[in-house]
Interface confidence: low
């Protein structure tokens, strides 16, 4: 009977800039799952006695638990679960509809640092010195999953990867995204976007690491051959990636049609719904095929751009061809041309 008291139980805290606080995710037989705060018969707004999660904090090499309850803003990953039975039991869980799930947050005390650490501790359990080399993507607070600054850890050494814009490294980026279980490489992030603009008041855990790596072999097929250690650079870029598995994705819906398979396209990304404005980068039907798929409809029958004679018509704009590639939406404040899409209805 799996519970968070078991020695082989695996958990991590995500969506924060610390391994000791965030949204609780657990590893069950088929991968990582976000735990809904409605689990174990609780209400989604109920706060628990945090001491019940002390084993989770211990396992993450953090201090005592400070709070256990709903996480502030939920970014629902692909898989979220509601569990039943005793608090902390994971032997009877079911997949939850993402829009019904409020994530469970846990905050543990940051570990006491007696001496400055040589590396940032890993996000879950601390590896043994013989642990294989591994990667970590560090997003800014509240930032995206599968987007951020790449850190490479080898044995007890860890740090960022120095990157020159002229480096021809497309194969490497694909390999890294793949290794991180984040799909394929989409684009490089500027450091501010990846969250590395350091604030002097930030905790030491998020100050730059004392080790830095340089790309040694951009065609490498195992991590130990990709990078070599260098003296940390005071200036220069570090490698920061956006991978195709980033979350939260833009969601779409069709409104104002005669069925769920036709209508004006609306989108959202963590906020409320707004009209999607037509974009010159999406003149092909690829974008609309994707929208139709998301509605669980058939392929695109037709799409037409509605006239934007109204200078006050507003909406959101995605500069990429597909919405799934759009890691952020821009606001269009006037002349937003809405798009009416008709998909094949699987249940006419």
């Amino acid at each position: 009977r799996l519970s968070w008291y078991d020695p082989d139980f695996q958990a991590r805290l995500t969506r924060s800039n610390s391994k000791c606080q965030g949204q609780l995710e657990v590893y069950l037989k088929d991968g990582w799952h976000m735990v809904c705060s409605q689990s174990w018969g609780r209400s989604s707004k109920q706060w628990e006695d945090p001491s019940q999660a002390s084993k989770v904090c211990q396992r993450l090499n953090c201090g005592v638990p400070l709070s256990l309850g709903p996480f502030l803003v939920t970014y629902t990953p692909q898989s979220s679960i509601i569990c039943y039975g005793q608090l902390g039991s994971f032997s009877n869980c079911s997949h939850s509809r993402n829009d019904m799930c409020h994530s469970l947050g846990l905050t543990c005390l940051e570990p006491q640092k007696t001496t400055p650490p040589t590396t940032r501790p890993p996000p879950t359990t601390t590896p043994e010195p013989t642990a294989p080399p591994r990667l970590q993507l560090v997003a800014q607070s509240g930032g995206q999953h599968c987007a951020g600054v790449v850190e490479f850890y080898s044995g007890s050494l860890g740090g960022t990867i120095s990157y020159e814009a002229q480096d021809k490294t497309q194969d490497l980026e694909n390999f890294l995204c793949n290794n991180l279980q984040c799909g394929s490489f989409l684009k490089h992030l500027p450091e501010t976007e990846a969250g590395r603009a350091q604030d002097p008041g930030e905790p030491r855990e998020h100050q730059p690491l004392p080790i830095q790596w340089k790309i040694q072999n951009s065609s490498c097929t195992s991590l130990e051959h990709c990078f070599r250690k260098i003296k940390p650079q005071k200036s220069g870029r570090v490698l920061a990636l956006l991978c195709s598995g980033f979350q939260p994705k833009v969601q779409s819906r069709l409104v104002g049609g005669s069925s769920i398979c036709e209508g004006t396209v609306e989108v959202r990304q963590g906020a409320q719904w707004a009209a999607l404005c037509d974009s010159s980068s999406a003149r092909s039907s690829l974008r609309w095929e994707e929208v139709c798929r998301e509605q669980q409809c058939g392929s695109v029958n037709s799409y037409r751009v509605l006239d934007a004679g109204d200078p006050t018509s507003r909406g959101l704009f995605c500069p990429h061809q597909k919405l799934s590639q759009c890691h952020e939406l821009w606001e269009r404040n006037s002349y937003c041309k809405k798009v009416f899409v008709t998909c094949q209805d699987p249940n006419p």
């Epitope: 607070s141 976007e193 906020a271 409320q272 952020e328």
Partner: nanobody, 112 residues
Framework: QVQLVESGGGLVQPGESLRLSCVVS????????WGWYRQAPGKQRELVAQ???????DYADSVKGRFTISRDNAKRTVYLQMNSLKFEDTAVYYC??????WGQGTQVTVSS
Amino acid sequence: QVQLVESGGGLVQPGESLRLSCVVSGDIFSFIGWGWYRQAPGKQRELVAQINTGGLTDYADSVKGRFTISRDNAKRTVYLQMNSLKFEDTAVYYCNFPGHSWGQGTQVTVSS
């Protein structure tokens, strides 16, 4: 629930400066683009400036060269530095991200 609190408005003379701040509660701050908007009496609300997560900015023609938008992710704050203020900048100023409901705003009055 995301809360937005705008501040920094006031009464100034033409040519003077103001700095508006908007503090955001909620983890949504870091990964979303932010905008400053304004609404003058009897007019439509308009987008004044916006900034995306990468720090790229965009301004309404009427404020280009005079207003600067910036953000501080650590403080979860978005700023609007307004220089060389004109009478026509008088309005209630709001900060927001696409699709969110509006806060209270902060009044800016330019008068001699």
